[in-house]
């Protein structure tokens, strides 16, 4: 309908204003509205002026129109020529009454369709509905994806590319892990991925100063160690070191008036030489205290070694051995005196006998023909040794004896000379001072070890070897090695240790094979003035453990493998250590601190006597244990 109207209008315009000249009224009849007429007529006059000479009057007159006038006039009413719309953004241009209308393509706006709509910034369709990147384009937009993603068929959503499936060898020997938009080459903990070699490399954490004292790096990890022998233990952060603290304080008060007989593991505590008038006879008086059952109290000899007298303890009773040119005798008698009480002992050479008294009561009288020691040059020269004898004497004894004696003497009077001179020597030497109060047991001060040689192989048993251990302990610190079996290659195939528990004021007992804990008894209150009892039995097939609370046969997946390691070591030679470890690497065991406290050990039915040890640190007390420190009102 519109085009028909346009054609009619065009025909009227041709007839009225080109073939003939028209005035404004006649033009009004063609356009039938004022805006178009007002727009057309001034431009029509310009066309006429261009193609006709002289002034044009509005009076109607006939004329021959030039073809150029026709084209000039025909062009006047078309508002869409020349095109006013933005070519990129318009869909169509509509000629209006002295105006135009540009119809815009989708994505464009404005009177002339000159403004691109940024669909990515549409508040009613945020980001153009794209899941990742919205790219605006002239008149449109499209969605795109970040690296590592692909566009889905809906052209809006992105899907992660699984690089691990696409390229299985992308990480080499490491594990490929797909992550949104990317992938990661993962290594086990303690390893770092090397891009060049496409492999996992061990991180040397020790080079990064992770540990306070000692660090051992191993593939995939590291372990920190603290010097237990210097009294340190690993803190809970497993990196720093802290002092092994006392959990049960002991009364370590000593008195110089009390002479400690076990100052040396091997050797004499005190050596005295007397030069007295020849009429002198041997005499010794002293108070004596011990829990030890065997050992040398005193040994006296002549200057030429030809005569000697031994005062010792055997089976808890006084024993006297003597030898001179006339006789050779051994006598044991009296009551058992290794009761931890002070006993007054006197040994006196009489004219025809040697009298031994305990608490002033005669317990032995030994006949002797002639003097014990022969005077020479009008003098009686005598050498006196406390708690031991010269090494060469050992072979001359009538009955061998273990000379080591853990005991104390006080109020001594030798050769009726009193204690003059001796006290002064002792006063300056702390090691020679005896504890004021002691109890039965063995004391490990946390500074050394004792070594035993024990044969664990039982030929009659099908197991081949077995270790049955009973421990009675009263620890003073919560961390330390109580018992360890050490191989010749400096490994520790079995150890029983104490560690402070994570729960406050309690301890754990660890059983370990080499540096692996095979069992942990948790949270025992061992730091008390009561002794704790622990037993375990181990052979190549089983590990059984009993505490006062429970008896347990331990079994877990890894145990048989660990017992196989122990079995291999037991078939070779192992040394038994009490109270700590010898010089083995820090990484050999989970714990390397010395044990501090009282402990009695029974292995395979035999109560271990520290006096029988192959070696023992001097500070370990074989048969005496300090009492628990009692808080007094003044302290």
């Amino acid at each position: 309908a519109n085009s028909l109207l346009e054609e009619t209008k065009q025909g009227n315009l041709e007839r009225e204003c080109i073939e003939e000249l028209c005035n404004k009224e006649e033009a009004r009849e063609v356009f039938e509205n004022d805006p178009e007429t007002d727009y057309f007529y001034p431009k029509y006059l310009v066309c006429l002026r261009s193609f006709q000479t002289g002034l044009f009057t509005a009076a109607r007159q006939s004329t021959n129109a030039y073809p150029d006038l026709r084209s000039c006039v025909n062009a006047i009413p078309d508002q869409c020529s020349p095109l006013p719309c933005n070519e990129d953004g318009y869909m169509s241009c509509k000629d209006g009454k002295a105006s135009f209308t540009c119809t815009c393509k989708p994505g464009w706006q404005g009177e002339k369709c000159e403004f691109d709509i940024n669909e990515c910034k549409d508040p009613s369709n945020i980001n153009g509905g794209c899941s990742q990147i919205c790219d605006n384009t002239p008149g449109s937009y499209h969605c795109s994806c970040k690296n590592g993603f692909v566009m889905l068929s809906n052209k809006k959503d992105c899907k992660d590319v699984d690089e691990c499936s696409l390229k299985p060898s992308i990480c080499g020997t490491a594990v490929c892990k797909n992550i949104p938009g990317d992938f990661e080459c993962e290594c086990p903990e303690g390893y770092r991925y090397n891009l060049k070699s496409k492999s996992c490399e061990d991180i040397d954490e020790c080079s990064e100063n992770m540990c306070a004292q000692l660090c051992v790096n191993y593939p995939g990890g590291y372990t920190c160690y603290c010097d237990g022998k210097k009294g340190f233990k690993l803190a809970q952060d497993q990196k720093s070191c802290e002092v092994v603290s006392v959990c049960l304080p002991l009364n370590l008060d000593t008195k110089y008036e009390l002479l400690y007989l076990a100052e040396q593991f091997a050797g004499v505590v005190l050596y005295l030489k007397f030069r007295l008038p020849e009429i002198s006879r041997f005499s010794a008086e002293f108070d004596f205290r011990t829990y030890d059952s065997e050992g040398v109290i005193l040994y006296a000899e002549s200057i030429d070694h030809s005569a000697w007298l031994l005062i010792a303890l055997r089976g808890g009773k006084i024993e006297v051995q003597l030898k001179n040119e006339h006789t050779s005798k051994i006598t044991t008698g009296g009551d058992v005196i290794n009761n931890g009480l002070w006993n007054m002992v006197s040994v006196e050479e009489l004219e025809h006998s040697i009298s031994i008294k305990i608490a002033k009561e005669a317990v032995m009288d030994i006949n002797k023909p002639g003097p014990l020691f022969k005077p020479e040059n009008g003098l009686l020269e005598t050498k006196v040794y406390f708690a031991g004898f010269p090494r060469k004497v050992e072979s001359e004894l009538i009955k061998p004896i273990n000379p080591r004696l853990d005991g104390c003497i006080r109020s001594w009077n030798l050769m009726k000379q009193g204690a003059s001179g001796i006290k002064e020597i002792i006063q300056e030497k702390q090691n020679k001072h005896c504890l004021v109060t002691v109890e039965k047991g063995s004391y490990y001060p946390g500074s050394g070890i004792a070594q035993f040689h024990i044969d664990y192989n039982n030929v009659s048993s099908a197991e081949g070897w077995h270790v049955n251990v009973t421990l009675n302990i009263r620890p003073s610190t919560g961390t330390g090695v109580m018992l360890a079996l050490v191989s010749g290659n400096n490994t520790v195939p079995f150890a029983v240790s104490l560690v402070d528990s994570t729960s406050e004021k309690s301890q754990d007992i660890l059983l370990s094979v080499e540096n692996t804990v095979i069992y942990r008894i948790q949270a025992l209150s061992l730091c008390s003035d009561q002794q704790s009892h622990l037993e375990f039995r181990v052979n190549r097939n089983n590990l059984e453990l009993s505490t006062p609370l429970k008896i347990e046969t331990i079994s877990h997946e890894d145990l048989q493998r660990q017992l196989a390691v122990l079995d291999k070591a037991m078939k070779a030679k192992v040394a038994t250590y009490l109270g700590g470890l010898p010089d083995v690497p820090f990484s050999a065991t989970p714990v390397n601190a010395f044990y501090n406290g009282c402990m009695e050990v029974n292995i395979n039915g035999v109560q271990l006597d520290l006096d029988e040890a192959i070696s023992k640190h001097n500070d370990i007390r074989a048969h005496s244990c300090p009492s628990v420190w009692k808080k007094t009102k003044n302290s």
């Epitope: 706006q109 404005g110 691109d116 709509i117 910034k121 508040p123 009613s124």
Partner: antibody
Framework: EVQLQESGPSLVKPSQTLSLTCSVT????????WNWIRKFPGNKLEYMGY???????YYNPSLKSRISITRDTSKNQYYLQLNSVTTEDTATYYC??????WGQGTLVTVSA | DIVLTQSPATLSVTPGDSVSLSCRAS??????LHWYQQKSHESPRLLIK???QSISGIPSRFSGSGSGTDFTLSINSVETEDFGMYFC?????????FGGGTKLEIK
Amino acid sequence: EVQLQESGPSLVKPSQTLSLTCSVTGDSITSGYWNWIRKFPGNKLEYMGYISFSGSTYYNPSLKSRISITRDTSKNQYYLQLNSVTTEDTATYYCAREFAYWGQGTLVTVSA
Amino acid sequence: DIVLTQSPATLSVTPGDSVSLSCRASQSISNNLHWYQQKSHESPRLLIKFVSQSISGIPSRFSGSGSGTDFTLSINSVETEDFGMYFCQQSNSWPWTFGGGTKLEIK
């Protein structure tokens, strides 16, 4: 028809955390962008942030250290958490799908 | 952040009047400017997006114009239901921001 409903405490003490829930019906929060906008007592509107259909978030930098927008697709709900609030956070809080569908708003007063 | 300033803050008109509300941006925002109406106790409603693009369901008496930094919302022959707050909002750059609003009230 998409409908959004804000819910949560109307009174929050200073220094505490403001927590609001937007429950959506008529549409799934796994499509589109889901926004939080607030209007202060003086009629000022502030755009707070969005959580998208994929779970990615955008926060207005002025709130970044305090704001968290999360969602639970199984409940078709999304959430606003604003930490360490002060009296300045007193406003009407709106949730909206794009900016075309809005909840009716909930007034939250921060006061001791 | 882009600041949008609306003027006047309040406009008092009689129903039947035609009005123009202004929104000025602190920097050019191209045509990423949208208008919202908020009546008392209601939530905002999108009226016009991208300066002049009409939203379905919105009466044709609402129209928009402008570009760059200066924009206008025109209401041809105001009706009683048109009274309330009008906000402009830009989506040119994050964070999206709103103008302070113009209150259209009955004279």
